[in-house]
């Protein structure tokens, strides 16, 4: 806080503003009649440097001129970039205990003469936009910079606008608030940059430009689209521009797509008409827009129109299959099932799907409509049956689907050969096979079908199916394929009016049981002991069981237990053993085995056969 | 209603200067646009010079271009025109004008400022 130098005056030689690297001879002059005493020689006059308001560096070293008392002069060097404060005090030398007092003081100011702005840009968003420009400043000047737009055109007028640079705010960019209208899009401007300083000025090279060079028209607005006759593959998209816009580009696609379709149109007028459109998809429509055919800018892309393109009559065929079941000797109960079709083939909301069983004789035919993908009727056992379902939108309804209902393994000779079932992976199983060796008749298709083997699988969860090609002998499953659980697969061979099957078990990933299977009783018959048990509970079978161990030794023996080993049939929850002598008590127990191992062992039965055994 | 007041003009020898102020009062928005025009005898009026209120974008005719400096003073609601080396050619009658402008071809367009002041005579004399 200096006073308004009532002692003195501090002036700077050659200017209080220098550039980078230059010294300055900063003079500090008492005023008459002031000091500290009548004795002049007792007045010493000294320097002190701030740099951002902290003293670092008293110059009484730096004198290079000195009138004892009334003046003193200090050479300063190697000023950083910036502001720099030196303040001259007053040291009264008779007075030790009295602090100097300030006499006036200086900043100096160290910097560099600007560089000529580069890079100038110019932009006007819109037709009734106006001009704003920017540029690259070059280096930090550290001093209070005034930079000058100048833009010169046609009608002999120069627009001028100013702004400036210093440590708090940055010049880089001006808009001039002024508009370019089409009507002079065959003229040239000009703009140049001046940058001003205490050291020095610099002016850009011209930038030469015309209306269409720097114009980026507005985005496209009020976009919307008319689908004609209510067609769902045939559109004309309309939108709002400005004036002179003579090239438009369109950008579509389906929401959930990563790639869009881009569609350039001349002289639109704010309408094109589509053509290939996706029946009942979501779409997202862009415009973008330009002013020139050649040369200009695209505008930035218009909002989006999100739209639903409306449906139209469901194409493709249903993937149809059945399941036989007897019910008495003379009736046979039929499900269908149908899988969904995928949307570019339903190509709408499916309502409903027509039905029709029919006896090939034409005698009988059961028809029905239904919302859900299976429909199940009981028919007689006797005549050739054949099946037909169509899918129905609010457009009309898809082509029927037909097949010929056949008794699906009653075929031994239609039988594939060497069905195997391999994990691939946690969720999908290879299953190969060789085809049946003395079929009657040609092989139309296989049908891979399978069900996880859990309780009620067979009425609560329809068959999940693939429909193979006859030349191939493969199928990767993977549709509700799920690790640790097993599945039964079979696979179908079908001709015109028969069917043969195979049936294997396999799972995609395995780990040994949870548990043993439990074992409920023992029961000696003639001679033989039965073991009974109940199976594992499903969840903790962790893949498909190959079979089950029964271990049995005497009790309080130590010797290693000894075992039968039984291939795993579900059906089957007993079997025999015959090898055990009367009167000795046994612990039995059973255990599960998976390819991947086996179970811990379930519960101990102690028994003492009492027959004879053997 | 807004009312523009020409003053300062007068007689003024060649090579001599001179400032015009335009005094405007009634300028409801700051988007108005002052331009200064002249008129010699038997001729056409002539754009001189404009300020955009606002922003304080600047335009000026060639013609005068490096003679002549427009700025304002927001605080006495004036904008003055300071005319230098003056040539015998300069002499006209200077009227300002406002209007809300922001073409760029319209700034010389005597016809699309909608306020007028009175005008001020300036002679140069030799």
């Known amino acids: 806080n200096i006073d308004v130098c009532k002692l003195g005056t501090v002036t700077v030689q050659p200017a209080p503003v220098i550039p980078l690297g230059s010294a300055a001879n900063i003079s500090c002059s008492l005023n008459p009649k002031q000091g500290c005493s009548h004795y002049p020689s007792s007045n010493e006059l000294i320097l002190l440097k701030f740099v951002n308001d902290v003293l670092v560096e008293n110059l009484h070293g730096k004198k290079v001129h000195d009138h004892t008392g009334h003046s003193s002069t200090f050479q300063v060097t190697n000023l950083s970039l910036g502001m720099t404060l030196f303040v001259c005090k007053l040291n009264c030398s008779n007075s030790q205990k009295k602090p100097p007092v300030p006499v006036c003081g200086v900043e100096i100011s160290v910097g560099v003469a600007p560089e000529p702005p580069q890079n100038i840009s110019c932009v006007q968003e819109g037709e009734n936009g106006t001009v704003a420009c920017s540029w690259n400043s070059g280096k930090v000047t550290y001093l209070k910079t005034n930079y000058t737009l100048q833009l010169s055109g046609p009608n002999n007028l120069t627009c001028q606008k100013q702004c400036f640079s210093d440590n708090r705010q940055n010049c880089n960019r001006l808009d001039l608030g002024i508009n370019l209208s089409p009507d002079l899009a065959e003229s040239r401007f000009i703009v140049r940059v001046t940058a001003i300083n205490d050291l020095g000025n610099s002016s850009s090279l011209p930038h030469t430009f015309t209306f269409l060079d720097i114009v980026i028209p507005l985005p496209p607005w009020d976009i919307r689209i008319n689908f004609l006759n209510a067609s769902g593959s045939r559109g004309t998209l309309q939108w709002e521009d400005e004036g002179q816009v003579v090239l438009n580009q369109l950008r579509y696609q389906p929401l959930n797509s990563t790639s869009w379709n881009m569609v350039n149109a001349t002289n639109a007028k704010g309408k094109y008409d589509l053509r290939d459109l996706r029946p009942f998809t979501e779409y997202e429509f862009q415009i973008s827009s330009k002013l020139h055919l050649s040369g200009g800018s695209w505008s930035n892309w218009s909002e989006s129109l999100r739209t639903r393109t409306p449906e139209e009559e469901p194409v493709g065929i249903l993937d149809i299959w059945y399941m036989k079941q007897d019910i008495d000797y003379d009736r046979q109960q039929i499900s269908l099932f149908w899988k969904s079709l995928n949307p570019s083939e339903a190509r709408g909301k499916i309502l409903h799907y027509q039905v029709t069983l029919q006896e090939v004789t034409k005698k009988t035919t059961l028809q029905n409509t239904t919302r859900h993908t299976s429909w199940t009727r009981v028919i007689p056992r006797t005549g050739a049956w054949t099946a037909s379902v169509s899918a129905a939108n609010s457009k009309g309804a898809s082509a029927p689907t037909h097949i010929n209902i056949v008794d699906l393994c009653g075929t031994g000779l239609l039988a594939p050969h060497q069905v195997s079932a391999k994990s691939e992976n946690m969720d999908n199983i290879l299953v190969t096979w060789q085809p049946p060796k003395k079929a009657d008749s040609a092989v139309r298709e296989y049908i891979v079908e399978w069900r996880a083997l859990q309780p009620g699988s067979i009425t609560k969860f329809p068959p999940h199916w693939l429909r193979i090609p006859p030349d191939n002998m493969s199928a990767l499953i993977s549709e509700n394929i799920k690790p640790y659980i097993c599945y039964e697969i079979r696979v179908h061979a079908l001709s015109e009016s028969q069917g043969g099957c195979s049936s294997i078990r396999g799972d995609s990933k395995h780990k040994a049981p949870v548990s043993g299977p439990h074992i409920t009783a023992i029961t000696e018959k003639k001679e033989r002991l039965f073991i009974s048990w109940t199976h594992i509970p499903f969840p903790e079978q962790r893949g498909c069981i190959l079979h089950y161990r029964i271990y049995w030794k005497e009790r309080d023996s130590t010797a290693q237990p000894e075992l039968c080993e039984i291939q795993y049939r579900r059906s089957q929850n007993s079997h025999p053993i015959s090898s055990l002598q009367p009167r000795v008590t046994y612990v039995l127990w059973m255990t599960a085995v998976t390819a991947a191992g086996e179970s811990p062992q379930g519960n101990e039965r102690e028994f003492c056969p009492q027959g004879k055994a053997n | 209603q807004v009312q523009l007041q020409e003053s300062g003009g007068g007689l003024v020898q060649a090579g001599g200067s001179l400032r015009l102020s335009c005094a405007a009062s009634?300028?409801?928005?700051?988007?108005?646009?002052i331009g200064w025009f002249r008129q010699a005898p038997g001729k056409e009026r002539e754009f001189v010079a404009a300020?955009?209120?606002?922003?304080?974008?600047?335009i000026y005719a060639d013609s005068l271009k490096g003679r002549c400096t427009i700025y304002k003073d927001n605080a006495k609601n004036t904008v003055y025109l300071q005319m230098n080396s003056l040539k015998l050619e300069d002499t006209a009658v200077y009227y300002c004008?406002?209007?809300?402008?922001?073409?760029?071809?319209?700034?010389?367009?005597?016809?699309?400022?909608?306020?007028w002041g009175q005008g001020t005579q300036v002679t140069v004399s030799s």
């Open positions: 004008a406002s209007g809300l402008i922001y073409r760029y071809s319209d700034f010389p367009r005597s016809q699309k400022y909608n306020f």
């Open positions: 009634g300028l409801t928005s700051s988007t108005y646009v």
């Open positions: 300020i955009m209120l606002s922003g304080g974008t600047t």
